[in-house]
Amino acid sequence: HTAAQDNCTCPTNKMTVCSPDGPGGRCQCRALGSGMAVDCSTLTSKCLLLKARMSARKSGRSLVMPSEHAILDNDGLYDPECDDKGRFKARQCNQTSVCWCVNSVGVRRTDKGDQSLRCDEVVRTHHILIELRHRPTDRAFNHSDLDSELRRLFQERYKLHPSFLSAVHYEEPTIQIELRQNASQKGLRDVDIADAAYYFERDIKGESLFMGRRGLDVQVRGEPLHVERTLIYYLDEKPPQFSMKRLTAG
């Protein structure tokens, strides 16, 4: 696994411990919490990052209406089970044997049950809607400039292929970023939209996961973009299975 060989660190994940004992005596970086080796040339999966985080703590609108099936992640943090590739396992349980099914972003998509609950597959989240509210500015940002800057950010900082950022909507002071990625579109080396969204979310909150990098500093034509509030909606390839029909808090 690649890492900065000279001083054996992981540029893309500060929640790691690196040592020169990998294959061939190379630098190997292990995610805290799970101990799994991570590829430091790309983003670490959200599941491993959440596990590491838990271990470290233990009408003319241009805006999109979230689908009735969109899930808003309100459950907060939990210590997830990751598979052998570092992705979320379909079924997650807590210490008290309460279990639930999650999507590929790790957000609950069913009612909670007991250990008899079955989750047949990890349902893929193919559409992520990131909604930001920016601090008041003297004048609204130019939509085209904002679009370009956010696309550049996702491509350069998060290594997300441009085709997966499908749209940037803007209605002052609300910005919406749409990420779309079907399983068939995602190549082996492509960053998952789930991971890009999570890194972006942590950046926005001033909790950057990148090693030694300053927090996010987005400027649109020299004007800093300060985010006051963030909401992220997740739309799965199959509707969530909650007992009440509502815009579900996941």
């Epitope: 411990v17 040592s19 004992d21 990998g22 101990g35 799994m36 598979d83």
Partner: antibody, heavy 115, light 107 residues
């Protein structure tokens, strides 16, 4: 050359505690994980846990979480394992071993818990 | 936790024979498997790391292969000094685990 030095034996009473040591030399102590392994007489090897001296990060196998505590003293390049509430089940040889591939091992400390 | 199953429990061979030890993991662990030899009253000694990488000072008759879930340690011409217990160990994720071991006996 890399060396991990452990005391040969420890005799303690049931219910007591013990602190086993492992003094490292011949490499940069803070750059490699240190692991502890238990082996009861005639039995196989069991991983207890590990510690990263460069940051103090620790991990434990579930069955040893309430039994052992791993610490390091970087100034003397020494790793320690504190074992508490000892019973005869804790009588075993305890090894310290370096890095994720366990490339160097101490000679092991034979812990005997007996009244 | 990742379970490592070693087979057989005991291997009995004649000097000069080729012998193979098997280790099977309960899930895909890539090549994060290492092999150890432990002689009577001795500390374990690393023979092979990352499934197939040789170790300085270890005789060339020892070799390893495999990836994913199935791994093999081979001794291409057994010598009497090879009488020992052999363990596989995974470093894919915590908790690290060992196989139960295979005892090598000489006929």
């Amino acid at each position: 050359q890399v060396q991990l030095q452990q005391p040969g034996s420890e005799l303690v009473r049931p219910g007591a505690s013990v602190k086993l040591s492992c003094k490292a030399s011949g490499y940069t102590f803070t750059s490699y994980w240190m692991h502890w392994v238990k082996q009861r007489h005639g039995q196989g090897l069991e991983w207890i846990g590990n510690i990263y001296p460069g940051g103090g990060y620790t991990n434990y196998d579930e069955k040893f979480k309430s039994k052992g505590t791993l610490t390091v003293d970087t100034s003397s390049s020494t790793a320690y394992m504190h074992l508490s509430s000892l019973t005869s089940e804790d009588s075993a040889v305890y090894y310290c071993t370096r890095s994720s591939v366990f490339d160097y091992w101490g000679q092991g400390t034979t812990l005997t818990v007996s009244s | 936790d990742i379970l490592l199953t070693q087979s057989p429990a005991i291997l009995s061979v004649s000097p000069g024979e080729r012998v193979s030890f098997s280790c099977r993991a309960s899930q895909n662990i890539g090549t994060s498997i290492h092999w150890f030899q432990q002689r009577t009253n001795g500390s374990p000694r690393l023979l092979i790391k990352y499934a197939s990488e040789s170790i300085s000072g270890i005789p060339s008759r020892f070799s390893g292969s495999g990836s994913g879930t199935d791994f093999t340690l081979s001794i291409n011409s057994v010598e009497s000094e090879d009488i020992a217990d052999y363990y596989c160990q995974q470093s894919n994720s915590w908790p690290f685990t060992f196989g139960s071991g295979t005892k090598l006996e000489i006929k």
